[in-house]
Amino acid sequence: QTSVSPSKVILPRGGSVLVTCSTSCDQPKLLGIETPLPKKELLLPGNNRKVYELSNVQEDSQPMCYSNCPDGQSTAKTFLTVYWTPERVELAPLPSWQPVGKNLTLRCQVEGGAPRANLTVVLLRGEKELKREPAVGEPAEVTTTVLVRRDHHGANFSCRTELDLRPQGLELFENTSAPYQLQTFVLPATPPQLVSPRVLEVDTQGTVVCSLDGLFPVSEAQVHLALGDQRLNPTVTYGNDSFSAKASVSVTAEDEGTQRLTCAVILGNQSQETLQTVTIYSFPAPNVILTKPEVSEGTEVTVKCEAHPRAKVTLNGVPAQPLGPRAQLLLKATPEDNGRSFSCSATLEVAGQLIHKNQTRELRVLYGPRLDERDCPGNWTWPENSQQTPMCQAWGNPLPELKCLKDGTFPLPIGESVTVTRDLEGTYLCRARSTQGEVTRKVTVNVLSPRYE
């Protein structure tokens, strides 16, 4: 009778084991072990027992002891069970961002590991077990579906293998995959709201505001604002679940025309975009041209108004005839025209909006000097000793210099309050002088003496 010890062994992969083959007869013709494993026979006294060191055991194996005794041949098997933890425990790659409300399939793959009967695969969220299944197949695959919730944000999912050899007197061997950190997000189906000027003038600045509500986590949202190829640099203000991105946009003549203004919000692996067109236009103020800004009375003056080729102008409220970018008027300069404003108003239609620009020029008319009865009376009669203010206003542009002298030397104090005396009486020659010429006028002052009864 052949016997083997131990009859069952559990050993780590690549390990060694001592196996003893024994026979019940004293002088066996043959005693050995049948195995393809590398073996080393340990020398022992006696013929009925042999000890072998079997090494580099990579797989389960069943070495067989055999002996040949006078009463016949017999065999006995030992069962070697190899254990080893999996070589690979891996969660199938997933996008780190997952939209709330989506079903997320977690797939764990396990390569290797033995004995499979003692190997379990566990899917976890943090420390909470989601699924536990025996490892079946090569690679073993365990899947579970998770409905993504907002509170899963930042949660770590992992896969763990448990090789439980405690029933065999060994320990529980655990292997854990690299964790998968879930980033959950909510990006509403509504596009962002974009507030901006529909038209923008060259060499000016406009303000663009892009906003969106109902985002989670709002701090992770990326906002891209651009006008054509020009990336804008917004200042972003965050609310609980909203943001507002404000940016200044400057445009130059190169940008003229219709440009696309885009606001894109990127969150997770999704994006929402709003497009708007902005018309960049160039519209200089109209030009008011006077033949000469300063003319002498009676001169013919041409006033021209010129604006953008597509504009329509009115000059002093009178539309151009025909309606267009140019208008003009002719006038003979009179003193009343001095300081007269000529206003040109130009209107340009840009993307359905009417843009208005104005320009005003003032005409200076040189005239005079003038001394007339109304403003410089030729005769004053004042009671003696009364308080009077002699008035004489000379008109003209430029304003004339006025002097009133009696006998070429005695001045009449124009515009000053004086006490009337006999000395004031007489005829004065008032002379108004400017670059335009000179005029004179006689002014007589009569003094009434009081009657003494």
Partner: antibody
Framework: QVQLVQSGGGLVQPGGSLRLSCAAS????????MHWVRQATGKGLEWVSA???????YYPGSVKGRFTISRDNAKNSLYLQMNSLRAEDTAVYYC??????????WGQGTMVTVSS | DIVMTQTPSSLSVSVGDRVTITCRAS??????LNWYQQKPGKAPKLLIY???TLQSGVPSRFSGSGSGTDFTLTISSLQPEDFATYYC?????????FGQGTKVEIK
């Protein structure tokens, strides 16, 4: 009677594959370790692979990673899948039963020629 | 790997002669030594296993001896059907290795 009958040899190009079969009869196939041995023309015998009763497999360095030994106890059959074949794999291949640590029963042999 | 060295590689003998073939292992293999006979175009045939045990059906003129590293196959009286090539093989360790063979030819 106890015998091993082989099939599956032939001519194959370098880099090609071939599968040899060995059908056992007359004994309890599942109770024995099985081996493949080859012999190049005019040369000696060379051990190629072994499979234990538990399905454990063994190979020399010259064929490891290219050859795969397997057994189907239900069909009393032994197989040798040979991939990435080289000219130096040209030989007569024998399957053999191992009993009492010796190859006591041999198949008739099958010729494998690797040549372009 | 255990290297098996057989001597001689060939020998010419006559029917009835005693033939001795030796086999040396590069390390101790206890009694895990087998002898095979192969005729041209045929599969090898097991003659002796465990260094000295005669395989069932093999004539008693064949015998084996030795243990450890040195082993001998003896054919006490060569018969015409014994002209063949003889191989020793160790089954102590994997890979299983064979001697290079000894060709026994008719003188």
């Amino acid at each position: 009677q106890v015998q091993l009958v082989q099939s599956g040899g032939g001519l194959v190009q370098p880099g090609g594959s071939l599968r040899l079969s060995c059908a056992a009869s007359g004994f309890t196939f599942s109770s024995y370790d099985m081996h493949w041995v080859r012999q190049a023309t005019g040369k000696g015998l060379e051990w190629v692979s072994a499979i234990g009763t538990a399905g454990d497999t063994y190979y020399p360095g010259s064929v490891k990673g290219r050859f795969t030994i397997s057994r189907d106890n239900a069909k009393n059959s032994l197989y040798l899948q040979m991939n990435s074949l080289r000219a130096e794999d040209t030989a007569v291949y024998y399957c053999a039963r191992s009993a009492l640590s010796a190859f006591d029963i041999w198949g008739q042999g099958t010729m494998v020629t690797v040549s372009s | 790997d255990i290297v098996m060295t057989q001597t001689p590689s060939s020998l010419s003998v006559s029917v009835g002669d005693r033939v001795t073939i030796t086999c040396r292992a590069s390390q101790s293999i206890s009694s895990y030594l087998n002898w095979y006979q192969q005729k041209p175009g045929k599969a090898p045939k097991l003659l002796i296993y465990a260094a000295s045990t005669l395989q069932s059906g093999v004539p008693s003129r064949f015998s084996g001896s030795g243990s450890g590293t040195d082993f001998t196959l003896t054919i006490s009286s060569l018969q015409p059907e014994d002209f063949a090539t003889y191989y020793c093989q160790q089954s102590y360790s994997t890979p299983r290795t064979f001697g290079q063979g000894t060709k026994v030819e008719i003188k």
